[in-house]
Interface confidence: medium
């Protein structure tokens, strides 16, 4: 039978590191906490897209806090050669697009998307929530952006920023993009509350994108998705104060803060400044 046929067909992971989707806490503001110590720490600044120094008071605060610049970069910028995406100007897909889907060993059963190299399309699969590989996207759009051939040979990132084919630069200030690539805050903020599969009843908050507010829900203790915060404040930080405004179809994306045009690399899920 088919199971016996598969006995010797084992899907092996590749040299690439596993996918870790951009963490919600990388979008949190630096939080020095209520204590009075003076401790040099680093946080990821979503506006400059760089890891920067701040003074931490020594208690509480949030998870966007790292002991070293390297740790911060490793966690929030993914500045890693294996993860840098070759743009479609060279008509190349990143290597991880060719990996088989990998559910991982855990039992979260989260809907994710992977690029199927046989059908040349992004398809849905169930991810367990841990381990796995990089061919794993939270939304169909993300998967298409990264692994399917984009329109006109452009690689379009999730912030609606388009690569300029002439000078290899990005213009994030005011870019017309197809409605498919509209930005509505971090992708997990758009997902519904997900209790998960276990039996606990923990008080958590999720961002309700319909009403634009953080609301409480009961979390089971395992699985679920990233739209899951231990406090309303954390929820608001991550989702309510999205740094790119909502837009109507065909409209312009405008950042809330002006930024200088920067030469950047296109990379999975994020824009990275060179030589950070």
């Amino acid at each position: 039978d088919s199971e016996e046929d598969e006995e010797h067909t084992i899907i092996t992971d590749t040299e690439l590191p596993p996918l870790k989707l951009m963490h919600s806490f990388c979008a949190f503001k630096a939080d020095d906490g209520p204590c009075k110590a003076i401790m040099k720490r680093f946080f990821f600044n979503i506006f400059t897209r760089q890891c920067e120094e701040f003074i931490y008071g020594g208690c509480e605060g949030n998870q966007n806090r790292f002991e070293s610049l390297e740790e911060c970069k490793k966690m929030c910028t993914r500045d890693n050669a294996n993860r840098i995406i070759k743009t479609t100007l060279q008509q190349e897909k990143p290597d991880f697009c060719f990996l088989e889907e990998d559910p991982g060993i855990c039992r979260g059963y989260i809907t994710r998307y992977f690029y199927n190299n046989q059908t040349k399309q992004c398809e849905r699969f169930k991810y367990g929530g841990c381990l796995g590989n990089m061919n794993n996207f939270e939304t169909l759009e993300e998967c298409k952006n990264i692994c399917e051939d984009g329109p006109n040979g452009f690689q379009v990132d999730n912030y609606g920023t388009q690569l300029n084919a002439v000078n290899n630069s990005l213009t994030p200030q005011s870019t017309k993009v197809p409605s498919l690539f509209e930005f509505h805050g971090p992708s997990w903020c758009l997902t519904p509350a997900d209790r998960g599969l276990c039996r606990a009843n923990e008080n958590r908050f999720y961002y309700n994108s319909v009403i634009g507010k953080c609301r409480p829900f009961k979390y089971s203790g395992c699985g679920g998705n990233e739209n899951n915060f231990t406090s309303k404040q954390e929820c608001l930080r991550a989702c309510k104060k999205g740094f790119i405004q909502r837009i109507s179809k065909g409209g312009l994306i405008k950042t809330k803060r002006k930024r200088k045009k920067q030469r950047v690399k296109i990379a999975y899920e994020e824009i990275f400044v060179k030589n950070m």
Partner: antibody
């Protein structure tokens, strides 16, 4: 209660292949809710995860980069066991090797008794 | 790889005392996927805590786990003679799964 019973030689010559087997009772190697892995422990390196195999819609495996070019973990559904093969061993591969069941949400909840493998000529 | 650093390396306490063991990750780890193990000489590790705070089957209530992000703690509220052992944390959030170097709890 899941039980894991390890078997295999305790002495392997350098450049040869280390082979260990882990027999499972109380669960199935094809279980949809677990992974079956190998961990080793040596004074110099502590506990080191080597890799595991697991079945969902098909078989998958995942290996530590440090041994990736040399390791194979295979299931044997007919005997309800899984095996470790580590090629081209050196004295640095001397360690106590454990097989373990990694629960889908709950850590490594069952372990084999451990096998001290010495790599020496 | 995610590096887990346990502290202290050795903890010298008397029976009845409270033990607090720390596990710090080099990157944030989902609290769903952090486990603690106990190991005695000549034995395989034994799962104590999974999901950072859930006790495994048969583990006494004096063992508790807490933490999130990069900082996790195993607490033994009142040490029993059989608790003197080495304790390891493990993350299975990101490939490869990694272990801490261990904390030995010894009798003072």
């Amino acid at each position: 209660q899941v039980q894991l019973q390890q078997s295999g030689p305790g002495l392997v010559k350098p450049s040869q292949t280390l082979s260990l087997t882990c027999a499972i009772s109380g669960d199935s190697v094809s279980s949809n809710g677990a992974a079956w892995g190998w961990i080793r422990q040596s004074p110099g390196r502590g506990l080191e995860w080597l890799g595991f195999i697991y079945r969902r819609s098909k078989w998958y495996n995942s290996y530590a980069v440090s041994v990736k070019s040399r390791i194979t973990i295979n299931p044997d559904t007919s005997k309800n066991q899984f095996s470790l093969q580590l090629n081209s061993v050196t004295p640095e591969d001397t360690a106590v090797y454990y097989c373990a069941r990694q629960d889908g949400m709950g850590g490594m909840d069952s372990w084999g008794q451990g096998t001290l493998v010495t790599v020496s000529s | 790889d995610i590096v887990l650093t346990q502290s202290p390396a050795t903890l010298s306490l008397s029976p009845g005392e409270r033990a607090t063991l720390s596990c710090r990750a080099s990157q944030s780890v989902s609290s769903f996927y952090l486990a603690w193990y106990q190991q005695k000489p000549g034995q395989a590790p034994r799962l104590l805590i999974y999901g950072s705070s859930s006790r495994a089957t048969g583990v006494p209530a004096r063992f508790s786990g807490s933490g999130s992000g990069t900082d996790f703690t195993l607490t033994i509220s009142s040490l029993e003679p059989e608790d003197f052992a080495t304790y390891y944390c493990q993350q299975y959030d990101s490939t490869p799964s990694t272990f801490g170097q261990g904390t030995k709890v010894e009798i003072k």
